[in-house]
């Protein structure tokens, strides 16, 4: 039980993209606030987003401390104006939200063909490494540093006057790919991290197609 | 558990139509990729096409491009093959199967139990 | 189309052999080749992916390996459930392709 007409918070939700996460829950606050908590399983909580009358909290600082950690979050429950009251147990109200770990869970974002080029019969295309809000000394690491070999790239291409949708597969970034002279090709991606067993693929980055400036050809 | 199921074969005459389910439960198919491959009576394995149910993006062999159609309901969880154009040539059992990486390779790890088409007058 | 020649198309042998069946691809594809294994009636089984890893369940008597563009099955010690047909497949480009099957008999 709670103080008198504070809310528990509920429908906590881990909403997270290449690491950036938020956490979101309901209801919208009516006379109260809310503070987040955040713990690893073996970890001290550490307290976010005080006394705010939104309903997410971003915590993607904490959680890339270790992105390969489990996390949990909760969310403690105020009477506006009068934090400092507490529930009859002593304690304000709150909720858990449910265990969230980044790195097998963190959705992959929309991947972004960087580049392609034509060498005769074969293309190169180049995926852009998008930058994380994941440190190692310092500096912000790319998906590609995060994940490794765990992440791979799936090309779809066809030629611009069919459907069918060709594959290939590339732990890198590049992907060399024979074509048929004198015709156009179009190219999306699409991110996916086979070991996993929720958020396996990215949405399908945009399509680029021969012709236009993104690419470049050369004959040889 | 992970599993399969084929259903709509049947008989059929030459120029008819015919569309195949392939169910799905214990994944979702939007998370993975779907192929569809026949065999003729004591021939070998012949692939079809696929389908990548997050995209819809398909790819079919020649002896069926233009006849032949997948498609993927993901509310269903479940991929069709749609065979239009009939011939005695396209009489085989039928597989849809599950694909998946390891690293870039591919593999096919899940199979239906298969469903017979016989195109005949 | 990338071609899988797999020989041979049949053999006979016995309870307890060594059995080889191979599969040339007819261009590079790397590691992307898988063997499945089909008994009469049935769909096919996935016995080995990525040229030599053993899928899941998969008794350890079966093996994979690669030289290049050659593909290779091995059943160390043949046991009664093995006589089937065996498949090659690549998946290094579209369309997959299979090779054409080799028939394991009782001698």
């Known amino acids: 039980s709670g103080t008198t007409n504070t809310v528990a918070a509920y429908n906590l939700t881990w909403k997270s993209t290449n690491f950036k996460t938020i956490l979101e829950w309901e209801p919208k606050p009516v006379n109260q606030v809310y503070t987040v908590q955040i713990s690893t399983k073996s970890g001290d909580w550490k307290s976010k987003c005080f006394y705010t009358t939104d309903t997410e909290c971003d915590l993607t600082d904490e959680i890339v401390k270790d992105v390969k950690q489990t996390y949990l979050a909760r969310v403690f429950s105020y009477p506006a104006g009068n934090v400092e009251s507490t529930g009859s147990a002593g304690e304000p109200l709150y909720e858990n939200s449910p265990e969230f770990t980044p790195y097998l869970e963190t959705n992959l974002g929309q991947p972004t063909i960087q580049s392609f080029e034509q060498v005769g019969t074969k293309v190169n295309v180049t995926v852009e490494d998008e930058r994380t809000l994941v440190r190692r000394n310092n500096t912000f690491l790319s998906l590609r540093d995060v994940f490794g070999k765990d992440l791979i790239y799936t090309l779809y291409y066809w030629k611009s006057s069919s459907s069918g949708k060709k594959t290939a597969k590339t732990n890198t970034n590049e992907f060399l790919i024979d074509v048929d002279k004198g015709e156009n090709y179009c190219f999306s991606v699409q991110a996916v991290i086979p070991s996993r067993t929720v958020n396996r693929k990215s949405t399908d980055s945009p399509v680029e197609c021969m012709g236009q400036e993104k690419g470049e050809f050369r004959e040889i | 558990e992970v599993q399969l199921v084929e259903s709509g074969g049947g008989l059929v005459q030459p120029g008819g139509s015919l569309r195949l389910s392939c169910a799905a439960s214990?994944?979702?198919?939007?998370?993975?990729?779907i192929h569809w491959v026949r065999q003729a009576p004591g021939k070998g394995l012949e692939w079809v096409g696929y389908i990548d149910p997050s995209n819809g993006y398909t790819y079919y062999a020649d002896s069926v491009k233009g006849r032949f159609t997948i498609s993927a309901d993901a509310s269903k969880n479940t991929a069709y093959l749609q065979m239009n154009s009939l011939r005695a040539e396209d009489t085989a059992a039928y597989y849809c199967a599950r694909a998946d990486y390891h690293g870039v390779d591919e593999y096919w790890d899940y199979w239906g139990q298969g469903t017979l088409v016989t195109v005949s007058s | 189309d990338i071609q899988m020649t797999q020989s041979p198309s049949s053999l006979s042998a016995s309870v307890g052999d060594r059995v080889t069946i191979t599969c040339r691809a007819s261009q590079d594809v790397n590691t992307a080749v898988a063997w499945y294994q089909q008994k009469p009636g049935k769909a096919p089984k996935l016995l080995i992916y990525s040229a030599s890893f053993l899928y899941s369940g998969v008794p350890s008597r079966f093996s994979g390996s690669r030289s290049g563009t050659d593909f290779t099955l091995t059943i160390s010690s043949l046991q009664p459930e093995d006589f089937a047909t065996y498949y090659c497949?690549?998946?290094?480009?579209?369309?997959?392709?299979f090779g054409q099957g080799t028939k394991v008999e009782i001698k």
């Open positions: 497949q690549q998946h290094y480009t579209t369309p997959p392709t």
């Open positions: 214990g994944f979702t198919i939007p998370a993975y990729w």
